[in-house]
């Protein structure tokens, strides 16, 4: 439905607070280096303008698109050229090219300082002194570090952030109350950001069809009692929501997401029996709850798939009449029967089925040709099953830290050109699959593990895309979205890699390591491990283990020493020499 003024329409639908928060998120995701105060000023100017349009939709400039209005506002920033370099060239373009240009300059790894958490009393004072500024700063800091964060979901995080401070700043033990809540929000936030980044990559790199296929599979698993037409409607609406958010259209995205939650709750009887609790919650909680809702029970007595998709004489006729609809129905029927499969596996099966039909429907005897198509699925199903079984056994044997180390070595040998911080971050996250998924029964392991790995490998892909250094990474990331994990799994040691020159400075440690948290200390040790493998890619597991054990003992010894710094200097030299000898460096 057309509106005379789009900005007035969204302001009226969303209300001032949601409008201001979403505009702040949008601006911070585009101009990631701009100071907080500058963004607040821009947001206030846009908000005041929106109010004039609400009062009179025919007022000057009120008929302009949101991209035009927001882009014009961003292009007023005085320091655009010196802060962002070539991004300033976007401002010479017209819409829609200007917005596309801004999107291309979003930085997944912006050069921003790590967020350091102040003392609890300091945070509580800041919260009480100016709650509005405190919460806006949270939105700003998260948005600029995570330029694809799902905006309406960030409002949900901010609401929980506010609730945590409201409750805990009045508590007897503020820290005991607040810190676990902030840790939980941080961890959930990182996971949410990474999941959304995959959705945006799917849309932007592989197109709407790829995203819709993913959505059909996932929603069919989640809502197996829903009819295909209902699932298709939800997929269409969900695709619109994510296309908007990934495209920077945050006001439309938030409005449409709320409409979708409303529709789902009004039609829950024909969608899922699991939605009742979600639908009793306020909007942000409701939308989040629906997105995370458990799979409904499968309908009883579902007929065999073979009848419609293999045995029927009309397979090629049905396929030819509407290829994507027929493949969509195949995916829907397969997914609703298999909550035990990962979405990416279901998509591989659908791709195999499509390839078979393309070949067989042009053959002399199509039915004879595609009669055994389901047999082709067996190895595709067994491959992730076996991989998960092996890795869960290894995880249970080693524990999370050592499992991460095994993956660090494995992935450094596969793609040693990738930067050490990226290898550490990605391998640590890959290693978390163990504690996240191996505890689940067999029926839940694959969807948990392989779909999580898709999210983590996408982090590697987007970080590598910024500064490409490995043809093998580029190949695995760009050839097929659903085969990324099998592609990386299949990589062997890179025999073309020339080992890195030994640099003693890389392996020089100081007393500051003693005051780090356990997590930070692990990262230091894992960074050293990656560097070690880059120097000696042919080192055996046993050699690496011996060096790492010596390193752990060295850190422990020097952290107990009276003169820590002297210990690190003297014992460090000995450790480096011993390690060089052990590895033949």
């Amino acid at each position: 439905d057309a509106h005379k003024s789009e900005v007035a329409h969204r302001f009226k639908d969303l209300g001032e607070e949601n409008f201001k928060a979403l505009v702040l998120i949008a601006f911070a995701q585009y101009l990631q280096q701009c100071p907080f105060e500058d963004h607040v000023k821009l947001v206030n100017e846009v908000t005041e303008f929106a109010k004039t349009c609400v009062a009179d939709e025919s007022a000057e400039n009120c008929d302009k698109s949101l991209h035009t209005l927001f882009g014009d506002k961003l292009c007023t920033v005085a320091t655009l050229r010196e802060t962002y370099g070539e991004m300033a060239d976007c401002c010479a373009k017209q819409e829609p090219e200007r917005n596309e240009c801004f999107l291309q300059h979003k930085d997944d790894n912006p050069n921003l300082p790590r967020l350091v958490r102040p003392e609890v009393d300091v945070m509580c004072t800041a919260f009480h002194d100016n709650e509005e500024t405190f919460l806006k700063k949270y939105l700003y800091e998260i948005a600029r570090r995570h330029p694809y964060f799902y905006a309406p979901e960030l409002l949900f995080f901010a609401k929980r952030y506010k609730a945590a401070f409201t409750e805990c700043c009045q508590a007897a033990d503020k820290a005991a109350c607040l810190l676990p809540k902030l840790d939980e929000l941080r961890d959930e936030g990182k996971a949410s950001s990474a999941k959304q980044r995959l959705k945006c990559a799917s849309l932007q790199k592989f197109g709407e069809r790829a995203f819709k296929a993913w959505a059909v599979a996932r929603l069919s698993q989640r809502f197996p009692k829903a009819e295909f037409a209902e699932v298709s409607k939800l997929v269409t609406d969900l695709t619109k929501v994510h296309t908007e958010c990934c495209h920077g259209d945050l006001l439309e995205c938030a409005d449409d997401r709320a409409d979708l939650a409303k529709y789902i709750c009004e039609n829950q009887d024909s969608i899922s029996s699991k939605l009742k609790e979600c639908c009793e919650k306020p909007l942000l909680e409701k939308s989040h709850c629906i997105a995370e809702v458990e799979n409904d029970e499968m309908p009883a007595d579902l007929p065999s798939l073979a009848a419609d998709f293999v045995e029927s004489k009309d397979v090629c006729k049905n396929y030819a009449e509407a290829k994507d609809v027929f493949l969509g129905m195949f995916l829907y029927e397969y997914a609703r029967r298999h909550p035990d499969y990962s979405v990416v596996l279901l998509l591989r099966l659908a791709k195999t089925y499509e390839t078979t039909l393309e070949k067989c429907c042009a053959a002399a005897d199509p039915h004879e040709c595609y009669a055994k198509v389901f047999d082709e699925f067996k190895p595709l199903v067994e491959e992730p099953q076996n991989l998960i079984k092996q890795n869960c056994e290894l995880f249970e044997q080693l524990g999370e830290y050592k499992f991460q180390n095994a993956l660090l070595v494995r992935y450094t040998k596969k793609v040693p050109q990738v930067s050490t911080p990226t290898l550490v971050e990605v391998s640590r996250n890959l290693g978390k699959v163990g504690s996240k998924c191996c505890k689940h029964p067999e029926a839940k392991r694959m969807p948990c593990a392989e779909d999580y790995l898709s999210v983590v490998l996408n982090q590697l892909c987007v970080l590598h895309e910024k500064t490409p250094v490995s043809d093998r990474v580029t190949k695995c990331c760009t050839e097929s979205l659903v085969n990324r994990r099998p592609c990386f799994s299949a990589l062997e040691v890179d025999e073309t890699y020339v080992p890195k020159e030994f640099n003693a400075e890389t392996f020089t440690f100081h007393a500051d390591i003693c005051t780090l948290s356990e997590k930070e200390r692990q990262i230091k040790k894992q960074t050293a491990l990656v560097e070690l493998v880059k120097h000696k890619p042919k080192a055996t597991k046993e050699q690496l283990k011996a060096v790492m054990d010596d390193f752990a003992a060295f850190v422990e010894k020097c952290c107990k020493a009276d003169d820590k710094e002297t210990c690190f200097a003297e014992e460090g030299k000995k450790l480096v020499a011993a390690s060089q000898a052990a590895l033949g460096l």
């Epitope: 009226k12 639908d13 969303l14 209300g15 001032e16 607070e17 949601n18 928060a21 109010k51 609400v54 919460l135 409002l155 949900f156 901010a158 609401k159 506010k162 938030a254 409005d255 709320a258 409303k262 306020p282 909007l283 942000l284 409701k286």
Partner: nanobody, 128 residues
């Protein structure tokens, strides 16, 4: 034109209760949220409470949480504000607002600019 009419104001002693009513009639377009604001002499109009029809969600200003309760009848486009444990600082003209946003605010704060139609107001005086 949407008409918004409040009733139920009056004089009450501290600790007492009052129930305000508000009916919106005429065109009901965009009556997604209805709410209450108040304005004490020499002060800005401030948010009190609101109800969003789309989810039946209610939200309140911190100063009235636990004492005031907003409820509504969507079919009649009517909202009520039950005010308990009234304090002298609750003294103000109470305004009903209609044609609010479709969705509740993430931080529970509404603004006069969010609403398209207003009543004339009803006086509430709490004596000590």
């Amino acid at each position: 034109e949407l008409q918004v009419v409040e009733s139920g104001g009056g004089l009450v002693q501290a600790g007492g209760s009052l129930r305000l009513s508000c009916a919106a009639s005429g065109r009901t377009f965009r009556s997604n949220t209805m709410g209450w604001f108040r304005q004490a002499p020499g002060k800005e109009r401030e948010f009190v409470a609101a109800i969003t029809w789309s989810g039946g969600t209610t939200y309140y200003a911190d100063s009235v949480k636990g004492r005031f309760a907003i409820s509504g009848d969507n079919a009649k486009n009517t909202v009520y504000l039950q005010m308990n444990s009234l304090k002298p600082e609750d003294t103000a003209v109470y305004y009903c607002a209609a044609e609010g946003p479709k969705w509740e605010p993430w931080n529970g704060i509404a603004h006069p600019a969010d609403f398209g139609s207003w009543g004339q107001g009803t006086q509430v005086t709490v004596s000590s």
